[in-house]
């Protein structure tokens, strides 16, 4: 038993972030003449928290009226709650002394934790793009959550993934915490339309995760394929050659014609058709005429995709003297392009 | 049950020092503080000091330069010395508990004459 | 020093009737919404006994006969109604500041 005893009922409160906390505290006693202190902290370096004697504290109101003749409540309520207030809160009885007020009895402390909701993952993906085959990294960052415990899942296209690392920071005690995950996927030429989610789970959420994308489409490319062909003459000496350029993405892309290494025409793909996976297909043709050349004829599509080294595609026309049935052709055997005859 | 007793000295010479012993039962004295008040002979009563629980000491400003209170908290005693004595501090005086001054001692008499 | 002065010094009632002692302060006595006056009965022989605290409430085993009331720096003890052995003298004490003081006292004789 004592003269006077502060008695704060709650050893802990737990408190949302945003909402307000009530700090409980009774004296048994109004005797010794003195006010009531709150702090956050014990020690030299005690946060004041309200003053009964005096200054502003705009945060905090009083459960009951301090003025009121024999109250002994000095509950404190703290408005707009963070997850910086955390910590252990004392009600702190001073008596007057001369000529400086001096601390009497002290409660026991209630420990504020405060729920503090993960801020929106965001996930990232590598700088540059990748093509398919290829392992690349995602990260999934979320911040300002407490307590610590918290899990994190990562998924493509509704299917979890398992290669990944997270880490919670810091390690030991915090006002809150930060979660950072980074996951391998590896890339598909299917992948322009997929997701990646990265999905954090919280006791503040409620059974209701949060999510954070990212579309692979962002981080894929994929090269095209280049096949040109030769059309049925159009005129008597005139052969239409086409590039047709096949299942590519991004759409950035260039394509440059040449005959016999130089440069016949540059022009960059506009009116693409759009696959069903995402991806781009554009034809390009070019109309030679034959009988401005004396000798064969090397025609090369070269591609420049996305700002990547060209690819390129050949086809020989033969200029021959020896005319043969019209429309027939044979393919050169043992090359890498299409050979056509031309009469 | 609570209970406070004074004992000490009944004749203290002038110019001595007077010292008094609180003797209490039925509380902590680390719990409570302990006063001393004194009441000349047909007079009113006379605060001298206070030793509170943690052993501070709060003291009337009319006689601080010659008061001393103490605790001996294992013994359950508070000692009251007073230097200087003259006729004017003879008086009864008292223990009382805490600030609010709710258990009193029977009160000893102390003479002070030569 | 905050001066306590007790009126009247002395006082004689009749049984039944009201007695009633003011205690005017030099300086307030109040703080923190309280009033740090108390009032203590003291019988020939015996040491003070505590009737009243903060101003109004009643020390426990204290007759409800007895009330306090006041603020700042003017205090009543009331005696309602007073009978035979409330006979003794009655001080007003203030711990609102330091030093503490008593007031001088007012004697109460039963008719």
């Known amino acids: 038993e004592e003269e006077l005893q502060v008695i704060q009922p709650d050893k802990s409160v737990l408190v949302a972030a945003g909402e307000t906390a009530t700090l409980r505290c009774t004296a048994t006693s109004l005797i010794p003449v003195g006010p009531i202190q709150w702090f956050r902290g014990a020690g030299p370096g005690r946060e004041l928290i309200y003053n009964q004697k005096e200054g502003h504290f705009p945060r905090v109101t009083t459960v009951s009226d301090l003025t009121k003749r024999n109250n002994m409540d000095f509950s404190i309520r703290i408005g707009n709650i963070t997850p910086a207030d955390a910590g252990t809160y004392y009600c702190v009885k001073f008596r007057k002394g001369s000529p400086d007020d001096v601390e009497f009895k002290s409660g026991a402390g209630t420990e504020l934790s405060v729920r503090a909701k993960p801020s929106a993952p965001v996930v990232s993906g590598p700088a540059a793009r990748a093509t398919p085959q290829h392992t690349v990294s995602f990260t999934c960052e979320s911040h300002g959550f407490s307590p610590r415990d918290i899990t994190l899942k990562w998924f493509k296209n509704g299917n979890e993934l398992s290669d990944f690392q997270t880490n919670v920071d810091p390690v030991g005690e915090s006002v809150s915490y930060s979660i950072h995950s980074t996951a391998k996927v590896v890339l598909t030429r299917e992948d322009v339309h997929s997701q990646v989610i990265c999905e954090v789970a919280h006791v503040t959420l409620q059974g209701d995760p949060l999510r954070g994308t990212a579309n692979l489409s962002e981080t894929i490319r994929v090269p095209p394929t280049l096949e040109v062909t030769q059309q049925p003459v159009r005129a008597e000496n005139q052969v239409n050659v086409t590039c047709q350029v096949r299942k590519f993405y991004p759409q950035r892309l260039q394509l440059t014609w040449l005959e016999n290494g130089n440069v016949s025409r540059t022009e960059t793909a506009s009116t693409v058709t759009e696959n069903k996976d995402g991806t781009y297909n554009w034809m390009s043709w070019l109309l030679v005429n034959v009988s401005a050349h004396r000798d064969d004829v090397k025609l090369t599509c070269q591609v420049e995709h996305d700002g990547q080294p060209a690819v390129s595609k050949s086809h020989d026309l033969k200029v021959s003297a020896h005319p043969k049935e019209q429309g027939s052709n044979t393919a050169a055997e043992n090359t890498g392009s299409n050979e056509r005859n031309i009469y | 049950q609570v209970q406070l007793q004074e004992s000490g000295p009944g004749l203290v010479k002038p110019s001595q020092t007077l010292s008094l012993t609180c003797t209490v039962s039925?509380?902590?004295?680390?719990?409570?503080?302990v006063n001393w008040i004194r009441q000349p002979p047909g007079k009113g009563l006379e605060w001298i000091g206070i030793?509170?629980?943690?052993?501070?000491?709060d003291y009337n400003s009319a006689l601080k330069s010659r008061v001393t209170i103490s605790v001996d908290t294992s013994k359950n005693q508070v000692f009251l010395k007073l230097s200087s004595v003259t006729a004017a501090d003879t008086a009864v005086y008292y223990c009382?508990?805490?600030?609010?001054?709710?258990?009193w001692g029977q009160g000893t008499t102390v003479t002070v004459s030569s | 020093d905050i001066v306590l002065t007790q009126s009247p010094a002395s006082l004689a009632v009749s049984p039944g009737q009201r007695a009633t002692i003011t205690c005017r302060a030099s300086?307030?006595?109040?703080?923190?919404?309280?009033?740090?006056m108390h009032w203590y009965q003291q019988k020939p022989g015996q040491p003070p006994k505590p009737l009243i605290y903060?101003?109004?409430n009643l020390e426990s085993g204290v007759p409800a006969r007895f009330s306090g009331s006041g603020s700042g720096t003017d205090f009543t003890l009331t005696i309602n109604p007073v009978e035979a052995n409330d006979a003794a003298n009655y001080y007003c004490?203030?711990?609102?500041?330091?030093?503490?003081?008593f007031g001088g006292g007012t004697k109460v004789e039963i008719k």
């Open positions: 004490q203030q711990n609102n500041e330091y030093p503490w003081t």
């Open positions: 009382a508990r805490a600030g609010k001054m709710d258990y």
């Open positions: 903060l101003a109004s």
């Open positions: 030793i509170w629980g943690d052993g501070s000491t």
């Open positions: 300086e307030s006595v109040d703080s923190y919404g309280n009033s740090f």
């Open positions: 039925g509380f902590s004295l680390t719990g409570y503080g």
